[in-house]
Amino acid sequence: EKSDLRTVAPASSLNVRFDSRTMNLSWDCQENTTFSKCFLTDKKNRVVEPRLSNNECSCTFREICLHEGVTFEVHVNTSQRGFQQKLLYPNSGREGTAAQNFSCFIYNADLMNCTWARGPTAPRDVQYFLYIRNSKRRREIRCPYYIQDSGTHVGCHLDNLSGLTSRNYFLVNGTSREIGIQFFDSLLDTKKIERFNPPSNVTVRCNTTHCLVRWKQPRTYQKLSYLDFQYQLDVHRKNTQPGTENLLINVSGDLENRYNFPSSEPRAKHSVKIRAADVRILNWSSWSEAIEFGSDDG
């Protein structure tokens, strides 16, 4: 991965270097070190400082994006003297050539699509490549199936998400024979990008006075349990006047998902459909197929 690294250092240098593949910043160890600290400053002047043991000569940045350019800094004190060194990490390449409008979503519990657009100043021969690194094992996944537009990669389809963890680092690199292409990177939470399927096994059973709706929680990529779900039921009387409000009922996830409501015989024809969301995000799934109950002459 090409990127200009420019060092700003006093006479006796720490020889600071950064490996963007491992997000590891390292420097030459100094004898009798009494204190050391490393941090980065981004373009918005936010400072990120990883924990560091005194005897270490490297530090690893866990959750950072680099495409806006950052400055790394290392401070080391020894029993004799102090060292300070800055390392500029710009996003080299022509401005506006990086992939833009990047987004990903997980669907059907085990598939993911990522899409992006070609940078506005990118040359005709630009080619983009997507790499994904998980937060735990730092294993790199290369895009297995690219989505193309006139030969340029503008998306990626993954059908094996086993390498992902709850938070992942996405990097879109670019190449061209004409000019340097800037990169784009992003950190995404799987829980924020998953689109749930609607609930399954929806059934309605009625007796003389009530109807009981039951359903099963959708299968998801994230390991979710019953309390993580919120449901919405749309109970709809058929053949009502246009503009009549549907009854939307909110139900919290439970071990046995059910909703019992009064409905006495003879009952008119109704339909019920259900959708699901993560209780903390409320990113609603599409509606399940409508289930009908009751009779036309009710």
């Epitope: 735990k136 709850s166 979710l224 349990s225 071990l255 046995e256």
Partner: antibody, heavy 120, light 111 residues
Framework: QVQLVQSGAEVKKPGASVKVSCKVS????????IHWVRQAPGKGLEWMGG????????VYAQRFQGRVTMTEDTSTDTAYMELSSLRSEDTAVYYC?????????????WGQGTMVTVSS | QSVLTQPPSVSGAPGQRVTISCTGS?????????VSWYQQLPGTAPKLLIY???KRPSGVPDRFSGSKSGTSASLAITGLQAEDEADYYC???????????FGGGTKLTVL
């Protein structure tokens, strides 16, 4: 109606092992995740271990590492917790519980508890 | 010594409102991780009362509510009833550790 029914009280000698069972009814064990928590007499709750989806394996609290084993028999929908090298301070009520959420760990439904007394 | 600090006891008269605090740190509640609350009636197993800071499982009356701010969380009980007399535990996660960490528990006495 989902229920967790635990095995009866046990009295053990120091150095022995105890195996507590937790039977799930009204649901299949494969669709659930079971964790174990204990409570010494007059004391608070202490998490012992259970299935961690991020690691895709059963994980144990550090202080029980090497002494505790949690297993499942899916044919009988029963979870087990075995604690070895028992000492008097292991005298406690041991609870199994169903995970209601993994993020963070939230225990939605609890068994009735099993009293384990360690005494010479 | 629990990493989540709760008052050992609180009390209130029937009909009153009481709150129970749970103080953590930047490596648990402030990390930020969600907080749950459990109620343990005398001689029984704990029961989940609040999850994801402020959500109630089905069957829990709306007299119970939870909130979280910074490194602390609190449980509020309004319209106190004699059957609310119990031990209450907060719980969350400690960064870098698996599983759950519980507060030391608070004994609620209804006067």
């Amino acid at each position: 109606q989902v229920q967790l029914v635990q095995s009866g009280a046990e009295v053990k000698k120091p150095g022995a092992s105890v195996k507590v069972s937790c039977k799930v009814s009204g649901y299949t064990l494969t669709e659930l995740s079971i964790h174990w928590v204990r409570q010494a007499p007059g004391k608070g709750l202490e998490w012992m271990g259970g299935f961690d989806p991020e690691e895709n394996e059963i994980v144990y609290a550090q202080r029980f590492q090497g002494r505790v084993t949690m297993t499942e028999d899916t044919s009988t929908d029963t979870a087990y917790m075995e604690l070895s090298s028992l000492r008097s301070e292991d005298t406690a009520v041991y609870y199994c519980a169903i995970v209601g959420s993994f993020s963070p760990l939230t225990l939605g439904l609890w068994g009735q508890g099993t009293m384990v007394t360690v005494s010479s | 010594q629990s990493v989540l600090t709760q008052p050992p006891s609180v009390s209130g008269a029937p009909g009153q409102r009481v709150t129970i605090s749970c103080t953590g740190s930047g490596s648990n509640i402030g990390a930020p991780y969600d907080v749950s609350w459990y109620q343990q009636l005398p001689g029984t197993a704990p029961k989940l009362l609040i999850y994801h800071n402020n959500k109630r499982p089905s069957g829990v009356p709306d007299r119970f509510s939870g909130s979280k701010s910074g490194t602390s969380a609190s449980l509020a009980i309004t319209g106190l009833q004699a059957e609310d007399e119990a031990d209450y535990y907060c719980a969350t996660v400690e960064a870098g550790l698996s599983g759950s960490v519980f507060g030391g528990g608070t004994k609620l006495t209804v006067l």
